[in-house]
């Protein structure tokens, strides 16, 4: 057969889905590897094929769309499962060829179980929510296109095995599940199921979510630096270790980039000809406000070391602020049998 | 170590009620759902519903619908099973019981009260 | 509701022996099933779920087994403190039932 443009296994859309569960799968080579869509490649004489490679197995073989009630079907540039069976797991190619062109691409599908308690290893997005803020929605994601507008499906919510009915601040409205007011407590993975009817049969979609309840841009401030401060002064003698936190609290905001430096005489320490090293910790409030300590540390410390200028600088979206650690040379203890008896004036 | 303490037995007129509660002591920081079951003298165990404190969430077996109402006041750790209009099948011990999340079905009958003698009598 | 169906509802054993409780779904549960242990004037004490995991420190010799409507409980060699009244209980479809019980009395 001629050559055709492999682009091998797309490991980045590693599609999973439940098991027993309608699924439909778009064929990637339109979404992300050709500038064209299906409809112009149609009309250009393009027919789309699909093939699979069993799980565990090494043999392409052609998808078999002659299965009872159609279980597997194409319709355009979708693949369709009604339902899905544990053993459509494997590698799927879709190619698309004439006589003159031919592009191809796979992709992984694993058809996963899930308990009573919809748990499962399905890797699950997570969508915050801002804590105190108001009323605050989810969707119910990744159902598009399974029926018409006109087949009105129930929609039940449930928190873990639990429906979610007479919660005192969450309420199922449809498709969508309204936070009041999120609280803590509502961290958690919440799961839509989606009930509709198709030619005689009951189809199931189960879709699930992680809820986390961040800090509200209400709350958000500039960076906090707690270290250094005026109440600390960092005291050495020459030879001595130099250790200076420098500890920043920065508030919750989404998608801003939090970050922490230090400057040595208003040069980054990389800059400079001193042997310092920085290390950092993160740790996180359970609202993800976010604490940042990078410590400098000079191992053996000289008198020059001391006399510099040692500041700490924090940057996020809210603002950038700096801080002055207080570093001096240590006053040597005086001798008391020469330094203290001149000072009495011995001869 | 997670206990549940229940009050103590009680005697009711049939037609009254009976609010028995359940204290829990060693909470999860994650929300949890409190259940209710019930065993009739000599009988086997039957399901009355639950409660997750932290969330205020709720249901009831079909057969207690319109009688039995389930409450926690999250600030003393505690939940209360009330059950109305008394007769004297449901004379039985009551028991709560819990798991430590809502994820996992099969541990939430975890840890069990000592149970409830609620006996119905005129 | 889905209906729970216990078997023997009296198994009588001799200490050291082994005995085999059944349980019966009326409809799939798939592997959500649980066991439990009641004695005389104790709460229930949960020994099995998932079909076939034992609860933190309930000994070896109790073990579960099966999945969809039928289920086994099986204790390998019978110990004096095991003489009790077993449940099974489904946890697939709400409302979560029991079975009738059975109890394993000293032969």
């Known amino acids: 057969s001629e050559r055709c443009d492999d682009w091998g296994l797309d490991t980045m859309r590693q599609i999973q889905v439940f098991e027993d569960e309608p699924a439909r799968i778009k064929c990637p080579l339109f979404e992300h590897f050709l500038k064209f869509n299906y409809s112009t490649a149609h009309s250009a004489g393009l027919t789309l094929i699909w093939y699979w490679t069993r799980q565990d197995r090494d043999l392409e073989e052609p998808i078999n769309f002659r299965l009872p009630e159609n279980r597997i079907s194409k319709e355009k540039d979708v693949l369709w499962f009604r339902p899905t069976l544990l053993n459509d797991t494997g590698n799927y190619t879709c190619m698309l060829r004439n006589t003159t062109y031919c592009s191809k691409v796979a992709f992984p599908l694993e058809v996963v179980q899930k308990d009573s308690c919809f748990n499962s290893p399905m890797k699950l997005p997570v969508h915050k929510l801002y804590i105190e803020y108001g009323i605050q929605r989810i969707t119910c994601p990744n159902v598009d296109g399974y029926f018409p507008s006109s087949v009105k499906p129930t929609i039940t919510w449930y928190m873990g095995c639990y429906k979610i009915q007479n919660f005192n601040n969450v309420i199922p409205e449809g498709m969508n599940l309204s936070f009041l007011i999120a609280l803590i407590s509502n961290n958690g993975n919440y799961t839509c199921v989606v009930t509709y009817p198709e030619n005689g049969r009951t189809f199931h979609l189960t879709r699930t979510l992680t809820v986390k309840v961040v800090g509200s841009p209400k709350n958000a401030v500039p960076p906090v630096i707690h270290s250094p401060n005026d109440h600390v002064v960092y005291e050495k003698e020459p030879g001595e270790e130099l250790l200076i936190p420098c500890t920043v609290y920065f508030s919750f905001l989404m998608d801003s980039r939090n970050e922490v430096w230090w400057t040595i005489d208003g040069k980054k320490p990389d800059d400079i000809t001193i042997d310092v090293t920085i290390n950092e910790s993160i740790s996180h409030s359970r609202t993800e406000d976010e604490t940042r300590t990078q410590i400098l540390s000079i191992k053996k410390v000289t008198s020059e070391d001391l006399k510099r200028s040692y500041v700490c600088h924090a940057r996020s979206a809210k603002g950038e602020v700096a801080k002055a650690a207080k570093v001096k040379q240590k006053v040597p203890a005086p001798r008391y049998t020469v330094e203290l008896a001149c000072g009495f004036g011995a001869t | 170590q997670v206990q549940l303490v229940q009050s103590g037995a009680e005697v009711k007129k049939p037609g009254s009620s009976v609010k028995v509660s359940c204290k829990a002591s060693?909470?999860?920081?994650?929300?949890?759902?409190i259940q209710w079951v019930r065993q009739a003298p000599g009988q086997g165990l039957e399901w009355m519903g639950y409660?997750?404190?932290?969330?205020?969430?709720?249901d009831y077996a079909q057969k207690f619908q319109g009688r039995v109402t389930i409450t926690a006041d999250e600030s003393t750790s505690t939940a209360y099973m009330e059950l109305s209009s008394l007769r004297s099948e449901d004379t039985a011990v009551y028991y709560c019981?819990?798991?430590?999340?809502?994820?996992?079905?099969?541990?939430?009958?975890?840890?069990w009260g000592q149970g409830t003698l609620v006996t119905v009598s005129s | 509701e889905i209906v729970m169906t216990q078997s023997p509802a009296t198994l009588s054993v001799s200490p050291g022996e082994r005995a085999t409780l059944s349980c019966r779904a009326s409809?799939?549960?798939?592997?959500?099933l649980a066991w439990y242990q009641q004695k005389p004037g104790q709460a229930p004490r949960l020994l099995i779920y998932?079909?076939?995991t034992r609860a933190t420190g309930i000994p070896a010799r109790f073990s579960g087994s099966g999945s969809g409507t039928e289920f086994t409980l099986t204790i390998s060699s019978l110990q004096s403190e095991d003489f009790a009244v077993y449940y099974c209980?489904?946890?697939?479809?709400?409302?979560?039932?029991f079975g009738q019980g059975t109890k394993v009395e000293i032969k």
């Open positions: 019981a819990r798991g430590q999340t809502l994820y996992d079905a099969g541990r939430q009958f975890d840890i």
């Open positions: 998932g079909a076939s």
């Open positions: 409809q799939s549960v798939s592997s959500n």
């Open positions: 060693g909470s999860p920081a994650e929300p949890y759902a």
């Open positions: 409660i997750i404190p932290s969330l205020g969430g709720y």
């Open positions: 209980q489904q946890y697939n479809n709400w409302p979560w039932t």
